[in-house]
Amino acid sequence: VKMAETCPIFYDVFFAVANGNELLLDLSLTKVNATEPERTAMKKIQDCYVENGLISRVLDGLVMTTISSSKDCMGEAVQNTVEDLKLNTLGREICPAVKRGVDLFLTGTPDEYVEQVAQYKALPVVLENARILKNCVDAKMTEEDKENALSLLDKIYTSPLC
Amino acid sequence: VKMAETCPIFYDVFFAVANGNELLLDLSLTKVNATEPERTAMKKIQDCYVENGLISRVLDGLVMTTISSSKDCMGEAVQNTVEDLKLNTLGREICPAVKRGVDLFLTGTPDEYVEQVAQYKALPVVLENARILKNCVDAKMTEEDKENALSLLDKIYTSPLC
């Protein structure tokens, strides 16, 4: 069965993290040869989703779906030249808007991250949930953890599974 | 704040259903002037997600994200003429691949629905979850319920909130 979506391994990891299922996360991370420190970093993010309960996972899943299906993401596919617009050349690369969001989630401030999410989803409950998760991640993760999460993301983005 | 995504009200309803939150579903349905029979139909679908637990919501959320960010959905945006490819003309319409999936979920057989999901996500656990949900919906919903769900979807697709 053909994996048709944009960077499938990224969404596998995201949903494993948001789901709170450690086994599923381990399976996904094994596919991209994650190191122990990289796994630890991802599990700290996962802890924040688990601590914040089901609503957190659903709302953040909504944010991810929303950004992934946004004009910004569709737009990335159509900003190239006409020759590149044939269906088979539409890259499996992760959408830059999703990349930006994930990057801000790790390296930005809560204000910046929430502002970026607000461009896609205005519901106050979604924004408040984004702020709670971001603050949790900042409190849990050391600078080294964030470095490891960023290096894992690089592996994901450059993986043949993306 | 600008709602940049494709047919936001559709995703609001989908995540309210999958979340199992009746209040959130009611709020979303009020926005599209759902009738009582239409609400009843959606609540029957919601019951299936609730009965199948958290994993069901997460896996089906993964299916939705996957289809929404697939080449098929990105592709729809680029199959038109070059003049239509300016970013600002990329519609807020729901992606036809998503429409097809929802339509099969209501009107197709379990095999047809699972086969469509399989084009986007090959994980056996995801496909099994899709089959369980589809069988549950078929058992719970009368033909009249399905008619009502389809008429509600028409309201969603043609809503100014889409």
């Epitope: 204000d111 929430v114 409190a139 | -």
Partner: antibody, heavy 120, light 106 residues
Amino acid sequence: QVQLVESGGGLVKPGGSLRLSCAASGFTFSDYYMNWIRQAPGKGLEWISYISSSGSTTYYADSVKGRFTISRDNAKNSLFLQMNSLRGEDTAVYYCARDGRYNTVAGDYWGQGTTVTVSS
Amino acid sequence: EIVMTQSPDFQSVAPKEKVTITCRASQNIGGSLHWYQQKPDQSPKLLIKYASQSFSGVPSRFSGSGSGTDFTLTINSLEAEDAATYYCLQSYTLRTFGQGTKVEIK
């Protein structure tokens, strides 16, 4: 070691302008978010603004919004605060402070401060 | 805007005694609360980040606890050099300091 040195303070009349600078050394300046924080004589600390590492994002406290502008020059390892329409209540010691890398904390290192006096 | 309220405003404590300073947020801020120490005529120094994490080089007698809206800074055995004003800061949304607690040695 990390060093932050503020300058540019002084006496200014109400309605006047002043530009504060903060020279950073001992760390990769372009990797860090930076803040301006002030302390009025005999009073507590008041956060007034922060800027992202690239300089693309800025935030302000309501008390200074529209009057103060934070900026940075990563090539020169410098942080700035342009203060316009100054008022008596802006009289304070102004500190620049660094955030932890990847925002792991607000204000992990501070400068020694520069004094701004707004008086006619 | 989130308002941070410290108590007490002033504390006079004998050496070797325990000092407890509290900080209350006007809304839930999770664990995004930091503590600073400012000695007279000096710039502030970070003591505790994210409610309970000691910053490097800070003596072990300083500890922090709490989450949500109520936070505590504890100095376990006060020393003469600890005479200072202590501030809490929230970074949950923008940044806001508490009004400060002055600790004097008896």
